[in-house]
C-alpha cells in the first residue's frame, strides 16, 4: 500500500523564496514519520527533511545547504525555501515515509514542482521601477 | 526596549544536563524566530539551535543533535535550551538571539549570555 | 557547510585611522551577509546586515560592501569605542555560519 502525494504543478518563487505544499492521502497525526523534498528528475539532491515523532515540534535539516522550515497539517507537510539561485530552478518532488506505528509505508512518486525561481535582483524597467529597499 | 536575560548556567559534569532560560521583553515575543549562539573560551561564535516563532519547528547544529532540545514558552516569553550528555567540548557561554521571522537567521538582538562549564 | 575566512586576524591601528576589514566565503553567499561587533564580556550586536545596510543606531563610519565570496566592513575613521572584535556571518546556506573573527586593537 503507496501514499499518494499530490503538489503543485508549478510554482514560481519571487524574492527568492517558496512555499511548497505536499499533499498526502494519510493522515500524520501521531506518526513518527519523515517527509523529505527532493530536487531534480532523479531526486538526486535532498533539499529539505522534516521530522516528526509525536511531539508538537517537528525536526528541520538540509544536509544539502538549503534554507528551510516546515509546517505540519494533518495530512500535509509544507516546506518553506528561502535564499534561492536562478540556477535552482528544477522540478521538486514531495517524499514521505511513515516509520510507526507498522506497517512502513512510503509514497507513489508524484508528478513533482516545478519550482521557476524569479531573482529579486532584477534591472527594473524605465517604466515600471522596482520598490528600493531602504 | 528589546531585553534578552539568560539563566540556567553553572558547572556540570560530563554527562550532566542543565536547562537555560532566556527571558524576552520589550517586544512581540511570539512574532519571531529564536536561536541559541555558543561562545567557547577566547574562541569565535558558533550557531547552536533555533525554533520558529510559534514553536512549531525547530533546527539543531549536527555537533548537537539528539543532545540539545529548544523550546519555548510564548504565554511566558520565555526560550529554552535543554542540554543533555554535556561534553567538555560544550563549555562556552550561550547566548539567545533574536532573528525577524523573515530573515531567519539573522541576528538582530542578543543576551549577555549565561556560561556552562563542563568538568569533573 | 560555508567556511567564511577573515582578515587580517589582527588590526592594529590608531583612534581616527580607516579600518578595513575582509570576509570571504568558500562559496557564494548572495548578499546575505552580516558584520558583528563584539568588545570583551559583552554580547555581539549587529552592524551591517545584507552586506551593505547599517542596523538601528548603527554610526554611518561603518558601510560595508560586496556580494557572492568577497566582503568588506570598513569603518572610516575609528573612534575609541570601535575597538573590538569583528564577525561576519552567513545566512545564504544551511547552518548559519560564522568567521573566526578580526581584532581591531589600538595600535
Known amino acids: 500500500n503507496k501514499i499518494l502525494v499530490k503538489q503543485s504543478p508549478m510554482l514560481v518563487a519571487y524574492d527568492n523564496a517558496v512555499n511548497l505544499s505536499c499533499k498526502y492521502s494519510y493522515n500524520l497525526f501521531s506518526r513518527e514519520f519523515r517527509a523529505s523534498l527532493h530536487k531534480g528528475l532523479d531526486s538526486a539532491v535532498e533539499v529539505c527533511v522534516v521530522y516528526g515523532n509525536y511531539s508538537q515540534q517537528l525536526q528541520v535539516y538540509s544536509k544539502t545547504g538549503f534554507n528551510c522550515d516546515g509546517k505540519l497539517g494533518n495530512e500535509s507537510v509544507t516546506f518553506y525555501l528561502q535564499n534561492l539561485y536562478v540556477n535552482q530552478t528544477d522540478i521538486y518532488f514531495c517524499k514521505i515515509e511513515v516509520m510507526y506505528p507498522p506497517p512502513y509505508l512510503d509514497n507513489e512518486k508524484s508528478n513533482g514542482t516545478i519550482i521557476h525561481v524569479k531573482g529579486k535582483h532584477l534591472c527594473p524597467s524605465p517604466l515600471f521601477p522596482g520598490p528600493s529597499k531602504p | 526596549e528589546v531585553q534578552l536575560v539568560e539563566s540556567g548556567g553553572g558547572l556540570v559534569q560530563p554527562g550532566g544536563s542543565l536547562r537555560l532560560s532566556c527571558a524576552a521583553s520589550?517586544?512581540?515575543?511570539?512574532?519571531?524566530?529564536m536561536h541559541w549562539v555558543r561562545q567557547a573560551p577566547g574562541k569565535g561564535l558558533v550557531w547552536v539551535s533555533r525554533?520558529?516563532?510559534?514553536?512549531?519547528?525547530?533546527s539543531h547544529a549536527d555537533s548537537v543533535k539528539g543532545r540539545f532540545t529548544i523550546s519555548r514558552d510564548n504565554a511566558k516569553n520565555t526560550l529554552y535550551l535543554q542540554v543533555n550528555g554535556l561534553r567538555a567540548e560544550d563549555t562556552a557561554v550561550y547566548y539567545c538571539?533574536?532573528?525577524?521571522?523573515?530573515?531567519?537567521?539573522?541576528?538582530?538582538?542578543w543576551g549577555q549570555g549565561t556560561l556552562v562549564t563542563v568538568s569533573s | 557547510e560555508i567556511v567564511l575566512t577573515q582578515s587580517p586576524a589582527t588590526l592594529s591601528l590608531s583612534p581616527g585611522e580607516r579600518a578595513t576589514l575582509s570576509c570571504r566565503a568558500s562559496?557564494?553567499?548572495?548578499?546575505?551577509l552580516a558584520w558583528y561587533q563584539q568588545k570583551p564580556g559583552q554580547a555581539p550586536r549587529l552592524l551591517i546586515y545584507?552586506?551593505?545596510n547599517r542596523a538601528t543606531g548603527i554610526p554611518a563610519r561603518f558601510s560595508g560592501s560586496g556580494s557572492g565570496t568577497d566582503f568588506t566592513l570598513t569603518i572610516s575613521s575609528l573612534e575609541p569605542e570601535d575597538f573590538a572584535v569583528y564577525y561576519c556571518?552567513?545566512?545564504?546556506?544551511?547552518?548559519?555560519?560564522f568567521g573566526q573573527g578580526t581584532k581591531v586593537e589600538i595600535k
Open positions: 538571539a533574536r532573528a525577524d521571522s523573515s530573515s531567519w537567521y539573522e541576528f538582530d538582538f
Open positions: 520589550g517586544f512581540t515575543f511570539s512574532s519571531y524566530w
Open positions: 525554533i520558529n516563532s510559534d514553536g512549531s519547528s525547530a
Open positions: 562559496q557564494s553567499v548572495s548578499s546575505y
Open positions: 545584507d552586506a551593505s
Open positions: 556571518q552567513q545566512r545564504n546556506n544551511w547552518p548559519p555560519t
